[in-house]
């Protein structure tokens, strides 16, 4: 999944309801799996920010070696730096672990730009601010990498939380979360609350800032407002979902919904941006430009290159439209919509501005591998990865950045027919199977 702007490579609503509103379903909360309610020990266990990823503290080996690990729902390997690297403050030292077992097998993961390679083994792993368990998990010990680790990011490895189908070198390598569920009584569910800064942070502030929460084994009610709406996981490889409609400030992009999911749509905490297929991106930008036409911005801004700066505190949020994605619902012909604000899709960038300036990058970008709902989307919502029931839940995040006029929203239900037709069926040739968005 590390294509384009994958992190390790670096980067009140208008609009009529769609058709008739359906009657409210029975409250979904009685049906949720896993432990309910409070997970105090896991709240605020993530640090970081959207531009460099969100990481959780983990320990590996015996005695335990503490590392910060990027939380990535767009890949399926647990991989950690295991050799000195200029950007790493620390790394996994296998020779110091009495519980390390060598699998005598290498792994090589190339990206569009960059790569990592390493040696496979297993060791004991735990999450200090997570469930009170220790599991034996597969670990890729990264011995060589290029454009993978990020200078100053403060993480030393990656926790791939997606399914075995996209694990490297092949799907026989059990991902960490599968091992966790198999070896413990922890329910097969986790949830993420990523809290974007909303304003530029200097390096001191960034290191001290709380980034959010990864709740393992359930849902924490304190992390969201309103109700959770669920969309089916279409296929268990990436966390693939189906988008059925896209609106900019309530205006339908009016595209064949297959275009929105060409060649897939995934939820990926390891990607910074909201990435859209070329045709969709072009239509969306045209619509966003039209909605914000009282100002004109350079082409480089819409390409995610140039930064637009305003005097501190004067960012004109109101001129930028909201973006709504309608997702397939759990009930036939029913959808719901998630709506993000410019506070999510204009990403604050530190270092370039003076203290008197607020500078932003446009964090919607073009993709050749389908829609990627990255941190830009996730920072608006509490996202539940309900693997047990093959569904992903969205609710308004208690920590999302907004203003006094608009807030991110999750709303439904809406009547939407023929949603199954919105999914793109990737041709299953030998070649395409080998190339699932990796090389």
């Amino acid at each position: 999944t590390h294509l384009g702007i994958r992190l390790p490579l670096r980067s009140g609503l208008a609009g009529p309801p769609l058709g008739l509103r359906l009657p409210r379903e029975t409250d979904e909360e009685s049906e949720e799996p896993g432990r309910r309610g409070s997970f105090v020990e896991m709240v605020d266990n993530l640090r970081g920010k959207s531009g460099q990823g969100y990481y959780v503290e983990m320990t590996v080996g015996s005695p335990p070696q503490t590392l910060n690990i990027l939380v990535d729902t767009g890949s399926s390997n647990f991989a950690v730096g295991a050799a000195p690297h200029p950007f790493l403050h620390r790394y996994y030292q296998r020779q110091l672990s009495s519980t390390y077992r060598d699998l005598r097998k290498g792994v090589y993961v190339p990206y569009t730009q960059g790569k990592w390679e390493g040696e496979l083994g297993t060791d004991l792993v735990s999450i200090p601010h997570g469930p009170n368990v220790t599991v034996r998990a597969n670990i890729a010990a990264i011995t060589e990498s290029d454009k993978f680790f990020i200078n100053g990011s403060n993480w030393e490895g990656i926790l791939g939380l997606a399914y075995a189908e996209i694990a490297r070198p092949d799907d026989s390598l059990e991902p960490f979360f599968d091992s966790l569920v198999k070896q413990t009584h922890i329910p097969n569910i986790f949830s993420l609350q990523l809290c974007g800064a909303g304003f530029p942070l200097n390096q001191t502030e960034a290191l001290a800032s709380v980034g959010g929460s990864m709740i393992i084994g359930g849902i924490d009610h304190s992390l969201y407002t309103g109700r959770l709406w669920y969309t089916p996981i279409r296929r268990e490889w990436y966390y693939e979902v189906i988008i059925v409609r896209v609106e900019i400030n309530g205006q339908d992009l009016k595209m064949d919904c297959k275009e929105y999911n060409y060649d897939k749509s995934i939820v990926d905490s390891g990607t910074t941006n909201l990435r859209l297929p070329k045709k969709v991106f072009e239509a969306a930008v045209k619509s966003i430009k039209a909605a914000s036409s009282t100002e004109k911005f350079p082409d480089g801004f819409w390409l995610g290159e140039q930064l637009v700066c305003w005097q501190a505190g004067t960012t004109p949020w109101n001129i930028f439209p909201v973006i709504s994605l309608y997702l397939m619902g759990e009930v036939t012909n029913q959808s719901f919509r998630i709506t993000i604000l410019p506070q999510q899709y204009l990403r604050p960038v530190e270092d370039v501005a003076t203290s008197q300036d607020d500078c932003y990058k446009f964090a919607v970008s073009q993709s050749s591998t389908g829609t990627v709902m990255g941190a830009v989307i996730m920072e608006g919502f509490y996202v539940v990865f309900d693997r047990a029931r093959k569904r992903i839940g969205f609710a308004v995040s208690a920590c999302h950045v907004h203003d006094e006029f608009r807030t991110a929203a999750v709303e439904g239900p809406f009547v939407t027919a023929d949603m199954e037709d919105c999914g793109y069926n990737i041709p299953q040739t030998d070649e395409s199977t080998l190339m699932t968005g990796r090389a």
């Epitope: 009282t294 100002e295 911005f297 350079p298 290159e305 140039q306 637009v308 700066c309």
Partner: antibody, heavy 120, light 108 residues
């Protein structure tokens, strides 16, 4: 051919407001393709951006001027203006108006400039 | 804040010689960099934009190169009218705002 011409008093007293106008000929301030900007150059020194304006009246200012600067546009007269309040001797400079073109990222056409001296 | 540092401050050359002017950014500005020429008593004139594109009417002896943090303006063979002050300007941060301190090209 598009031309820009600055006009306004060459001498302003300290604490008063400096007011300059840029008249655009051979083109239009209502074009959607350009911003319009003011840059100044103190004697013997480098260039300093003051601010820019779009046809809609949307403005961007150099934060170092804080709240002293106001730029406005009058598309009916094909003019845009600069007001800089509470001036001091440090504001003595040649003031240029310019068109922001080439993807609204560079100053591609400039006026000839006008020297404004702040002195009592 | 992105700072542009130009070097040398002064370049003393003779007509017909090759001039190489440097502009270094304190952090990457991609290719969002321009060069201007300013003759005494005149307004600046845009020479190069987006690091390497010549503006309308600019002679071919002027060329720009570089990306990221290091940029070069080259005048392949100095003409008498080329003796002037040259400024670089970045527009990675928009609106365009930051100029370098200038390099004076004078007759040796």
């Amino acid at each position: 051919q598009l031309q820009l011409q600055e006009s306004g008093p060459g001498l302003v007293k300290p604490s008063e407001t400096l007011s300059l106008t840029c008249t655009v000929s051979g083109g239009s301030t209502s074009s959607s393709s350009y911003y319009w900007g003011w840059i100044r150059q103190p004697p013997g020194k480098g260039l300093e951006w003051i601010g820019s304006i779009y046809r809609s009246g949307s403005t961007y200012y150099n934060p170092s001027f804080k709240s002293r600067v106001t730029i406005s546009v009058d598309t009916s007269k094909n003019q845009f203006s600069l007001k800089l309040s509470s001036v001091t001797a440090a504001d003595t400079a040649v003031y240029y108006c310019a068109r922001v073109g080439h993807g609204i990222s560079y100053f591609d056409l400039w006026g000839r400039g006008t020297l404004v001296t702040v002195s009592s | 804040e992105i700072v542009l540092t130009q070097s040398p401050a002064t370049l003393s050359l003779s007509p017909g010689e090759r001039a190489t002017l440097s502009c270094r950014a304190s952090q990457s500005v991609s290719s969002y960099l321009a060069w201007y020429q300013q003759k005494p008593g005149q307004a600046p004139r845009l020479l190069i934009y987006d690091a390497s594109n010549r503006a309308t009417g600019i002679p071919a002896r002027f060329s720009g190169s570089g990306s990221g943090t290091d940029f070069t303006l080259t005048i392949s063979s100095l003409e008498p009218e080329d003796f002037a002050v040259y400024y670089c300007q970045q527009s990675l941060t928009w609106p365009p705002r930051t100029f370098g301190g200038g390099t004076k090209v004078e007759i040796k």
